[in-house]
C-alpha cells in the first residue's frame, strides 16, 4: 500500500497524477479532497466498492490503459460529481449499468478498447441524461449492436464507435439517439454500413467513417423512408477505395441533400481514374458540397492516371477546396476553368513547380479565387510564380511559405487586387520592390534577412519574427503598420521616440532578442505602463542579454546602479 | 546549395548485398522524392525506382523489384538503397538524384561505382 | 513500358551550327496539356544533367541555346550555335507513366 501510495501526487486543488507506474490497485485513503484522479497506465486489475467511496468530489477519473477486468457493482456509487470516466484499453468484458446508474453528472465516457462482445443486457447510458461524449467498442470482439444499446440518450455532442469487427446490426439501434454532432464510425468491412447509415442519416451533423475497405462497396437503393438528412459533412478517415467504388460511394453521398464539407484524410485510392462518364453524368449531382479536403491521399498507380473529365462538371460549384500532401504536380487548366465558384485553394506540401502551376492557373482558371495556399512545393522563383498568378484577377491572399526562393528580384508581377503575402520560412536574405505595395499584411518570419528598409504604405500587419534584424524598421515606411512581430531577431535595443514614430501600433512583440539593459533602456521600459499593452509578450520574452551579470533576466525585474550603467 | 553527396565504390562478391548512401544537404530533405538510376558500363540510364522521404512511400521499377530496397533515415538526410543477391550484371555506376515537380531529376549525386567480382 | 527511341544514335556537327537530337516515345506522353518529357546532358564520368523538363521548359541556369520542343510522342532537342563544351550524350527521359524510362542516348561529335 505504502508504495502505491507513494506513486500518487497530488495539487493544492485536488488534482492527482499517478499515471505510468507500477500501481496495482487504486492507492488508499483518497479523500473528498481529490477532483481529479489520473491512474491510466498502471497495473491496476479490480476496483472495489470501497476505494473510491470517500471521493465524492471526483470530477475526473482516468483509469485508461491498465488491466481492469473486474469492477464491483456499487463502485461508483458515490461519484455524483464525476463529469470525465475513461475505463478505456482494460480487460472489462462485461459491462454493468449499475455502475454508471449513479453517475448523474457525466458528460464524457470513454469505453473503447475493452474486450466485450455487446453493450451489455440492458440499457447502459439511459441514467446518463447530461453526456456529451461517449466512446465504445473494441477492434476485434465488439460485433453486435443492438437496439437498446442507446436507449435514453437523446443527444450527443460525439460518439465514437469501433465496430472494426461488426457482424450484427439491429435496425434502428442508432436512430433512438435524436441529435449526435459528430458520429465517428470504425468499420473493417463495409457489410452494415447502409443499415446503420439509414438510421444516422436524419440525425448525424457530421459522419466520419474510419479505417473500412470500400473497395468493393456497392450502393443500393436506401430503403429509407425520409430523405431529410441532416448530414452537413462527411468525412471518409484511412479508407481504401477504387475508381468503381468512388462512383458508388458518390451514389451514396447523393442520399445527403444538405451536404455542404467531404473530407477524405489518409485515403488510398486503387485507381486509374477510370470514371465511367456515362454513368456519372447521369447519376452523381454534387448537391450543394461547398467544401471539399483531401489529405494524405495515396494513389499507388498515380502515373497511370489519366482522364478525370468526366468529374468536371461535379466542381462548378464548389467554394473551398484542400489537397494537401498528395503529390500533386499538376492541376489540368480544363479542371481550374470548370472551379467557377471556387474562392480558397489549399495546395500545401505537394509537388507543384512554377512551369507547371502555368498550365494549372490558365486564362480564365479559377474565375472566383481569392486565396491560393502553395505552401512547401517545388516553387524556386517569386519572378515566377508571381507571373504566372496574373491570371487569376480575384486572388488577394496568396501563401507560398516553406518553398525555396533564397533571392529575391529587384522587381515582380503580382495579381493586382494583394493583399496578403506569406513568404515565411522560403530562405529568403533580402527583400526588394518585388513585395506588392497593394499588401495590408505581409510574412517574411524564418529567413535570413537582416534589414527591412521597403515602402509599404498600406501595411498593417508585419510578421517578421526569427530573422537577423539589429533594429525596428523605419516607421515611416509603414505608415498604416497595426501589428508587429519582430521577436526572435538580433535586436539591443528600442527607445521611445521609436516606438512613438509608429503612429497606428497597437501591437508589437518583440521578445527572444539580445537586449542590452543600458539605463535608457531599463528606464523606458519599466516606466512605461502603457507598453504592456503594446507588447504582447511582455514581461516573459524580453530578457537581458548583457551586462552580463544580469543576462538572462527580465528586463522588467533588472536593476542597475549608475555606475555600472551599460551606455550603447 | 542544393547537393547529394554519394557513399564511394564498392568491390563485393557475388551473391553478397552492398547499401549505397546518398546524403542531401542544401533543401529541405522531406519535400522531395529521391530517385536511383543505375548506368551500366557505356550503356544508358534505366530508372530503379523513388523514394519519399516524407511518408517513405517507394515506387519501383519492376526490373528492380527484388533486387533493390529503399530507404531513408529523416534526421541525417539520407537515402539508402540496399542491393541483394548481387551478380555480375549489377556491376554499374549508381546514381541519386532529387525529384522535383513530380517529374523531373534536377541535381544528381556524383554516382557510385559498384563492381562485383569475386 | 514506354519505349524511347532516340535519333541518330550519334550526330557530327560543326561549332556554331544547330544540332536537333530526336526522341520518339511509343505512346503518347501528354498529361493534361503538359508533356512529361525531360533531356538530359551527360558528360563523361559525370551525372547527368537536367537541360529541359516539361518538353520546352528550360531548367534554370541552363545556356539559351538550349531548347525544347514537341508534343505528344514526338520531341526534339535543339543546340544552337552548338559550342565545344556541348560535344557529349544526351538522353531523353518520360515521366508520364511508371517504369520511367530514358532514350538510348546520342552522342554528339565534331564534324
Known amino acids: 500500500e505504502s508504495s502505491n501510495q507513494a506513486s500518487l501526487s497530488c495539487d493544492r486543488n485536488g488534482i492527482c497524477k499517478g499515471s505510468s507506474g507500477s500501481l496495482n490497485s487504486i492507492p488508499s485513503g483518497l479523500t473528498e479532497a481529490v477532483k481529479s484522479l489520473d491512474l491510466s497506465n498502471n497495473r491496476i486489475t479490480y476496483i472495489s466498492n470501497s476505494d473510491l467511496q470517500r471521493c465524492v468530489n471526483l470530477q475526473a477519473l482516468v483509469l485508461t490503459s491498465n488491466g481492469i477486468n473486474t469492477i464491483e457493482e456499487d463502485s461508483f456509487s458515490s461519484l455524483g460529481s464525476l463529469e470525465h470516466l475513461d475505463l478505456s484499453y482494460n480487460y472489462l468484458s462485461n459491462l454493468s449499468s449499475s455502475w454508471f446508474k449513479p453517475l448523474s453528472s457525466l458528460t464524457f465516457l470513454n469505453l473503447l478498447g475493452n474486450p466485450y462482445k455487446t453493450l451489455g443486457e440492458t440499457s447502459l447510458f439511459s441514467h446518463l441524461t447530461k453526456l456529451q461524449i461517449l466512446r465504445v467498442g473494441n477492434m476485434d470482439t465488439f460485433t453486435k449492436i443492438q437496439r437498446k444499446d442507446f436507449a435514453g440518450l437523446t443527444f450527443l455532442e460525439e460518439l465514437e464507435i469501433d465496430a472494426s469487427d461488426l457482424q450484427s446490426y439491429e435496425p434502428k439501434s442508432l436512430k433512438s439517439i435524436q441529435n449526435v454532432s459528430h458520429l465517428i464510425l470504425h468499420m473493417k468491412q463495409h457489410i452494415l454500413l447502409l443499415e446503420i447509415f439509414v438510421d444516422v442519416t436524419s440525425s448525424v451533423e457530421c459522419l466520419e467513417l474510419r479505417d473500412t475497405d470500400l473497395d468493393t462497396f456497392h450502393f443500393s437503393e436506401l430503403s429509407t423512408g425520409e430523405t431529410n438528412s441532416l448530414i452537413k459533412k462527411f468525412t471518409f478517415r484511412n479508407v481504401k477505395i477504387t475508381d468503381e467504388s468512388l462512383f458508388q460511394v458518390m451514389k451514396l453521398l447523393n442520399q445527403i441533400s444538405g451536404l455542404l464539407e467531404l473530407e477524405f484524410d489518409d485515403c488510398t485510392l486503387n485507381g486509374v481514374g477510370n470514371f465511367r462518364a456515362s454513368d456519372n453524368d447521369r447519376v452523381i449531382d454534387p448537391g450543394k458540397v461547398e467544401t471539399l479536403t483531401i489529405r494524405r491521399l495515396h494513389i499507388p498507380r498515380f502515373y497511370l492516371f489519366y482522364d478525370l473529365s468526366t468529374l468536371y462538371s461535379l466542381t462548378e460549384r464548389v467554394k473551398r477546396i484542400t489537397v494537401e500532401n498528395s503529390k500533386v504536380f499538376l492541376v489540368p487548366c480544363l479542371l481550374s476553368q470548370h472551379l467557377k465558384s471556387l474562392e480558397y485553394l489549399d495546395l500545401s506540401e505537394n509537388l507543384m513547380v512554377e512551369e507547371y502551376l502555368k498550365n494549372s492557373a490558365c486564362e480564365d482558371a479559377w474565375p472566383s479565387l481569392q486565396t491560393l495556399i502553395l505552401r512547401q512545393n517545388h516553387l524556386a522563383s517569386l519572378e515566377k510564380t508571381g507571373e504566372t498568378l496574373l491570371t487569376l484577377k480575384n486572388l488577394t491572399n496568396i501563401d507560398i511559405s516553406k518553398n525555396s526562393f533564397h533571392s529575391m528580384p529587384e522587381t515582380c508581377q503580382w495579381p493586382e487586387k494583394m493583399k496578403y503575402l506569406n513568404l515565411s520560412s522560403t530562405r529568403i536574405h533580402s527583400v526588394t520592390g518585388c513585395i506588392p505595395k497593394t499588401l495590408e499584411i505581409l510574412d517574411v518570419s524564418n529567413n535570413n534577412l537582416n534589414l527591412f528598409s521597403l515602402n509599404l504604405p498600406q501595411l498593417k500587419e508585419l510578421y517578421i519574427s526569427r530573422n537577423k534584424l539589429m533594429t525596428l524598421p523605419d516607421a515611416s515606411l509603414l505608415p498604416m503598420l497595426l501589428v508587429l512581430k519582430i521577436s526572435r531577431n538580433a535586436i539591443t535595443t528600442f527607445s521611445k521616440e521609436q516606438l512613438d514614430s509608429f503612429h497606428t501600433l497597437k501591437t508589437l512583440e518583440a521578445g527572444g532578442n539580445n537586449f542590452i539593459c543600458s539605463c535608457e533602456f531599463l528606464s523606458f521600459t519599466q516606466e512605461q505602463q502603457a507598453l504592456a499593452k503594446v507588447l504582447i509578450d511582455w514581461p516573459a520574452n524580453y530578457l537581458c542579454d548583457s551586462p552580463s551579470h544580469v543576462r538572462g533576466q527580465q528586463v522588467q525585474d533588472v536593476r542597475l546602479s549608475v555606475s555600472e550603467c551599460h551606455r550603447t | 546549395q542544393v547537393q547529394l553527396q554519394q557513399s564511394g565504390p564498392e568491390l563485393v562478391n557475388p551473391g553478397a548485398s552492398v547499401k549505397l548512401s546518398c546524403k542531401a544537404s542544401g533543401f529541405t530533405f522531406t519535400t522531395y522524392g529521391i530517385n536511383w538510376v543505375k548506368q551500366g558500363p557505356g550503356q544508358g540510364l534505366e530508372w530503379i525506382g523513388w523514394i519519399y522521404p516524407r511518408d517513405g512511400s517507394t515506387n519501383f521499377n519492376e526490373n528492380f523489384k527484388d533486387k533493390a530496397a529503399l530507404t531513408v533515415d529523416t534526421s541525417s538526410s539520407t537515402a539508402y538503397m540496399e542491393l541483394h543477391s548481387l551478380t555480375s550484371e549489377d556491376s554499374a555506376v549508381y546514381f541519386c538524384a532529387r525529384l522535383t515537380g513530380g517529374t523531373f531529376l534536377d541535381y544528381w549525386g556524383q554516382g557510385t561505382t559498384l563492381t562485383v567480382s569475386s | 513500358d514506354i519505349v524511347l527511341t532516340q535519333s541518330p544514335a550519334s550526330l557530327a556537327v560543326s561549332l556554331g551550327q544547330r544540332a536537333t537530337i530526336s526522341c520518339r516515345a511509343s505512346?503518347?506522353?501528354?498529361?493534361?496539356?503538359?508533356?512529361?518529357m525531360q533531356w538530359y546532358q551527360q558528360k563523361p564520368g559525370q551525372p547527368p544533367k537536367l537541360l529541359i523538363f516539361g518538353a520546352s521548359n528550360v531548367e534554370s541556369g541552363v545556356p539559351v541555346r538550349f531548347s525544347g520542343s514537341g508534343s505528344g510522342t514526338d520531341f526534339s532537342l535543339n543546340i544552337h550555335p552548338v559550342e565545344e563544351d556541348d560535344i557529349v550524350m544526351y538522353f531523353c527521359?518520360?515521366?508520364?507513366?511508371?517504369?520511367?524510362?530514358f532514350g538510348g542516348g546520342t552522342k554528339l561529335e565534331i564534324k
Open positions: 527521359q518520360q515521366s508520364r507513366k511508371l517504369p520511367w524510362t
Open positions: 505512346e503518347s506522353v501528354e498529361y493534361y496539356g503538359t508533356s512529361l
